[in-house]
């Protein structure tokens, strides 16, 4: 699992590859802060609750974020 609480940032390794939006349990976007100088995106998968760190600079990940926000805006009244 590419996560660690012992370093300033949560993510050790990041992926450029998108996942299926429907397989996401949760998508956390952690802004840059005094503790970690970069934005971090942590995807929690429905299957096994596995967490994955996604590269916020990747165009494919940006496309994923757009798809997720579009899906959420459809659902909200």
């Amino acid at each position: 699992v590419p996560l660690s609480r012992t370093v300033r940032c949560t993510c050790i390794s990041i992926s450029n590859q998108p996942v299926n939006p429907r397989s996401l349990e949760k998508l956390e976007i952690i802004p840059a802060s005094q503790f970690c100088p970069r934005v971090e995106i942590i995807a929690t998968m429905k299957k096994k609750g596995e967490k994955r760190c996604l590269n916020p600079e990747s165009k494919a990940i940006k496309n994923l974020l757009k798809a997720v926000s579009k899906e959420r805006s459809k659902r909200s009244p």
Epitope: N16, P18, N20, R52, K59, A60, N63
Partner: antibody, heavy 119, light 107 residues
Framework: QIQLVQSGPELKKPGETVKISCKAS????????MHWVKQAPGKGLKWMGW????????TYADDFKGRFAFSLETSASTAYLQINNLKNEDTATYFC????????????WGAGTTVTVSS | DIQMTQSPSSLSASLGGKVTITCKAD??????IAWYQHKPGRGPRLLLH???TLQPGIPSRFSGSGSGRDYSFSISNLEPADIATYYC?????????FGSGTKLEIK
């Protein structure tokens, strides 16, 4: 050099199953998603979906949900497309394409596998 | 899904001449368009991405421009090797879409 080598042509009957392969070489297989594209005879290119090569998770375009399955053999750097319960309209050339996910376009393609479905 | 309308479906031009192909998206695709050359029996070949960036090894006879919903692709100083079908691809969405293709013939 970077290449995607696809399996040879297939002749099948309606109702049968076909599984075609796409073997990657020249790069780290799990660093890039793999996509599949269909070209029916005399028609254009149609995107079918992709498989995340890190976790083996497939995502299908709406027109390819149900009878189509993407899978991997990571140790052999190979992606597979399986089509079940073949229909005449599945007659086409199928291409695998590596996606350069950081920028999100397809940069490397296989030469295609022709599947003919005929009774 | 984003729809891509490509035109013309075919065109014929003279050696040494210039051709232009257009693709129109049904929404803003933020310059995320790529162009491919496709010859029978081979996989498509990436020519340009992000509207106008040439892939390494692709001659500068190939060019692209556009923004918003409207994009164009040109080939100048046409050569026999340019005979092929050309496709645009939008990649500003998780769901990719190709244009319908333009078959180029040489007079």
């Amino acid at each position: 050099q970077i290449q995607l080598v696809q399996s040879g042509p297939e002749l099948k009957k309606p109702g049968e199953t076909v599984k075609i392969s796409c073997k990657a070489s020249g790069y780290t297989f799990t660093d890039y998603s793999m996509h599949w594209v269909k070209q029916a005879p005399g028609k254009g290119l149609k995107w079918m979906g992709w498989i995340n090569t890190e976790i083996g998770e497939p995502t299908y375009a709406d027109d390819f949900k149900g009878r189509f399955a993407f899978s991997l053999e990571t140790s052999a750097s190979t992606a597979y497309l399986q089509i079940n319960n073949l229909k005449n309209e599945d007659t086409a050339t199928y291409f695998c394409a590596r996606n350069y996910d950081y920028d999100a376009y397809f940069d490397v393609w296989g030469a295609g596998t022709t599947v003919t479905v005929s009774s | 899904d984003i729809q891509m309308t490509q035109s013309p479906s075919s065109l014929s031009a003279s050696l040494g001449g210039k051709v232009t192909i257009t693709c129109k998206a049904d929404q803003d695709i933020n310059k995320y368009i790529a162009w491919y050359q496709h010859k029978p029996g081979r996989g498509p070949r990436l020519l340009l991405h992000h509207t106008s960036t040439l892939q390494p090894g692709i001659p500068s006879r190939f060019s692209g421009s556009g923004s918003g919903r409207d994009y164009s692709f040109s080939i100048s100083n046409l050569e026999p090797a340019d005979i092929a079908t050309y496709y645009c691809l939008q990649y500003d969405s998780l769901l990719f879409t190709f244009g319908s293709g333009t078959k180029l013939e040489i007079k």
